[in-house]
Interface confidence: medium
C-alpha cells in the first residue's frame, strides 16, 4: 500500500522510505476524534513533508494534519467512520506515498487509569480495580484489558491476565509472601473496532503480607 515518488523533480525524495503508520482515537476529546501518524524510519527528513487524509470524511473532501515535532496529528469531528480513507505523505501537491485505511481498524484506546489493589484479609486475595474512559463512549465501548504484574525484583517476568471487565481477583497463594509487586493495565478494542494496545496505565505498587508461621498463611 505504500509507494514512492516517480517525478524527476523529486529525485532526493525517491531515495527515502516514507513508510508510515497511524492510529485513531475516537471521542478522545468529547465528540472529537484524533488521528496520529508517524514515519517508521525515525531518520526521515520531515522538512516540507505533509500528511493529508481524503475520503470517508464529513462535509469536507480532505483534511491536512498538524505537525507536532516528529508526529502528524488531526483532531476533528469529521471522520465518517465508514469505509476507507486515503492517507498520503505529500511534498507540496505531489504525493510520495499513500495508504488506504479504515479508521475503525486502527483504533488505539486511551490508557486505563485509577488502577488500585486492595488486600482482603478474610478472603486471602487481592482485588485489582481500574477505570477506563471508554465506558462512557458511544463508539469504542467494548475493550479487552491486559493486566500485567511482576515481582519488583523480576525485571522481565511479567504475568499477564486478559479480561473484559475492570475488576480482577488475584489469589494470595499465587503470589510470593512479603514481596513488592508492580501491576499495570492496558486495553485493546474488542468487538466491532480493531486496532492496537493502548499505552500502559501508570503502575501501581503493592506489598504482599508475610507468612503467618502458625497457619502457613500470609499476614
Amino acid at each position: 500500500e505504500s509507494g514512492y515518488a516517480q517525478n524527476g523533480d523529486l529525485e532526493d525524495a525517491e531515495l527515502d522510505d516514507y513508510s508510515f503508520s497511524c492510529y485513531s482515537q475516537l471521542e478522545v476529546n468529547g465528540s472529537q476524534h484524533s488521528l496520529t501518524c508517524a514515519f517508521e524510519d525515525p531518520d526521515v527528513n520531515t522538512t516540507n513533508l505533509e500528511f493529508e487524509i481524503c475520503g470517508a470524511l464529513v462535509e469536507v473532501k480532505c483534511l491536512n494534519f498538524r505537525k507536532l515535532q516528529e508526529i502528524y496529528f488531526i483532531e476533528t469531528k469529521k471522520f465518517l467512520l465508514i469505509g476507507k480513507s486515503n492517507i498520503c505523505v505529500k511534498v507540496g501537491e505531489k504525493s510520495l506515498t499513500c495508504k488506504k485505511i479504515d479508521l475503525t481498524t486502527i483504533v488505539k484506546p486511551e490508557a486505563p487509569f485509577d488502577l488500585s489493589v486492595i488486600y482482603r484479609e478474610g478472603a486471602n486475595d487481592f482485588v485489582v480495580t481500574f477505570n477506563t474512559s471508554h465506558l462512557q463512549k458511544k463508539y469504542v465501548k467494548v475493550l479487552m484489558h491486559d493486566v500485567a504484574y511482576r515481582q519488583e525484583k523480576d525485571e522481565n517476568k511479567w504475568t499477564h491476565v486478559n479480561l473484559s471487565s475492570t475488576k480482577l481477583t488475584l489469589l494470595q497463594r499465587k503470589l510470593q509472601p512479603a514481596a513488592m509487586y508492580e501491576i499495570k493495565v492496558r486495553s485493546i478494542p474488542d468487538h466491532y473496532f480493531k486496532g492496537f494496545w493502548s499505552e500502559w496505565s501508570p503502575s501501581y505498587y503493592f506489598r504482599t503480607p508475610e507468612i503467618n508461621n502458625s497457619s502457613g498463611e500470609m499476614d
Epitope: 469536507v60 465518517l80 465508514i82 469505509g83 463508539y139
Partner: antibody
Framework: EVQLVESGGGLVQPGRSLRLSCAAS????????MHWVRQAPGKGLEWVSG????????GYADSVKGRFTIFRDNAKNSLYLQMNSLRAEDTALYYC??????????????WGQGTTVTVSS | AIQLTQSPSSLSASVGDRVTITCRAS??????LAWYQQKPGKAPKLLIY???SLESGVPSRFSGSGSGTDFTLTISSLQPEDFATYYC???????????FGQGTRLEIK
C-alpha cells in the same frame, strides 16, 4: 464501466426462502460498503440492509431483521441477500447499490436495475 | 431511527417553472442528506449529496440547500425530462442505517 447486476428474484410462496445476488464490476469492490434497497409496486424506496467493505458493519431495516441476512464475497465481487420466512409484504423490486463515502456523507451513487421478488401462494 | 418527511407528496408544474421540494428530518443530521431522482421503470439516480453538492453529470438547474433538520431541492427551470419522483435520503454510520423520505412525485401540469 461501473456496473451492478442483480439476480435470483422470482415467485416464491410465503414462508419460503430466496437468495438474491449482485455481481459488481468496474470498481474496487472491497473498498465500498454495499446495500440492498427495495421498492414495492407503486411505493417508495425502502432501505433493506447494508454491509461495510469488510463485513464487520452490518445493518437491517426493522421490517426484515431476523429474517434476512446480508453477506458479501470480496473475492468474487459479489453481494448477497438471503431472505428467509418470506411474507407477502416482501414483494418488491430489489436493488443492489454501491456507497460512495469519498464524497463525504454516505450516498448511493451506483444502482443496479433490480430483480423482482414476488411472494404469493 | 431518524424519520424523513418530504413535502409535498406530489405536485404539478409546467416546463420552465421553478420547483422546490422540502425534506424535514425528525432530528438534526448536519448536512448528511442526499437527493435522488427516479423515473418510472428505472433505478434511482443520485443528484445531490452533502445536502448541497451536485453529483457529476447532473445539470446545474438542480440545487440543494439546508442543514440540521430542514432541506430543500430546487429545480430552477423545469425541463421535460425532470418529471419524475424525487427522494431524500439520510444515513447513520454506527450502527449502519439508511432512511429514505416517502418521495415527491413531480407531474406535468
Amino acid at each position: 464501466e461501473v456496473q451492478l447486476v442483480e439476480s435470483g428474484g422470482g415467485l416464491v410462496q410465503p414462508g419460503r426462502s430466496l437468495r438474491l445476488s449482485c455481481a459488481a464490476s468496474g470498481f474496487t469492490f472491497d473498498d465500498h460498503a454495499m446495500h440492498w434497497v427495495r421498492q414495492a409496486p407503486g411505493k417508495g424506496l425502502e432501505w433493506v440492509s447494508g454491509i461495510s467493505w469488510n463485513s464487520r458493519g452490518i445493518g437491517y431495516a426493522d421490517s426484515v431483521k431476523g429474517r434476512f441476512t446480508i453477506f458479501r464475497d470480496n473475492a468474487k465481487n459479489s453481494l448477497y441477500l438471503q431472505m428467509n420466512s418470506l411474507r407477502a409484504e416482501d414483494t418488491a423490486l430489489y436493488y443492489c447499490a454501491k456507497d460512495e463515502y469519498s464524497r463525504g456523507y454516505y450516498v448511493l451513487d451506483v444502482w443496479g436495475q433490480g430483480t423482482t421478488v414476488t411472494v404469493s401462494s | 431511527a431518524i424519520q424523513l418527511t418530504q413535502s409535498p407528496s406530489s405536485l404539478s408544474a409546467s416546463v420552465g417553472d421553478r420547483v422546490t421540494i422540502t425534506c424535514r428530518a425528525s432530528a438534526g443530521i448536519s448536512s448528511a442528506l442526499a437527493w435522488y431522482q427516479q423515473k418510472p421503470g428505472k433505478a434511482p439516480k443520485l443528484l445531490i449529496y452533502d445536502a448541497s453538492s451536485l453529483e457529476s453529470g447532473v445539470p446545474s438547474r438542480f440545487s440543494g440547500s439546508g442543514s440540521g433538520t430542514d432541506f430543500t431541492l430546487t429545480i430552477s427551470s423545469l425541463q421535460p425530462e425532470d418529471f419524475a419522483t424525487y427522494y431524500c435520503q439520510q444515513f447513520n454510520s454506527y450502527p449502519l442505517w439508511i432512511t429514505f423520505g416517502q418521495g415527491t412525485r413531480l407531474e406535468i401540469k
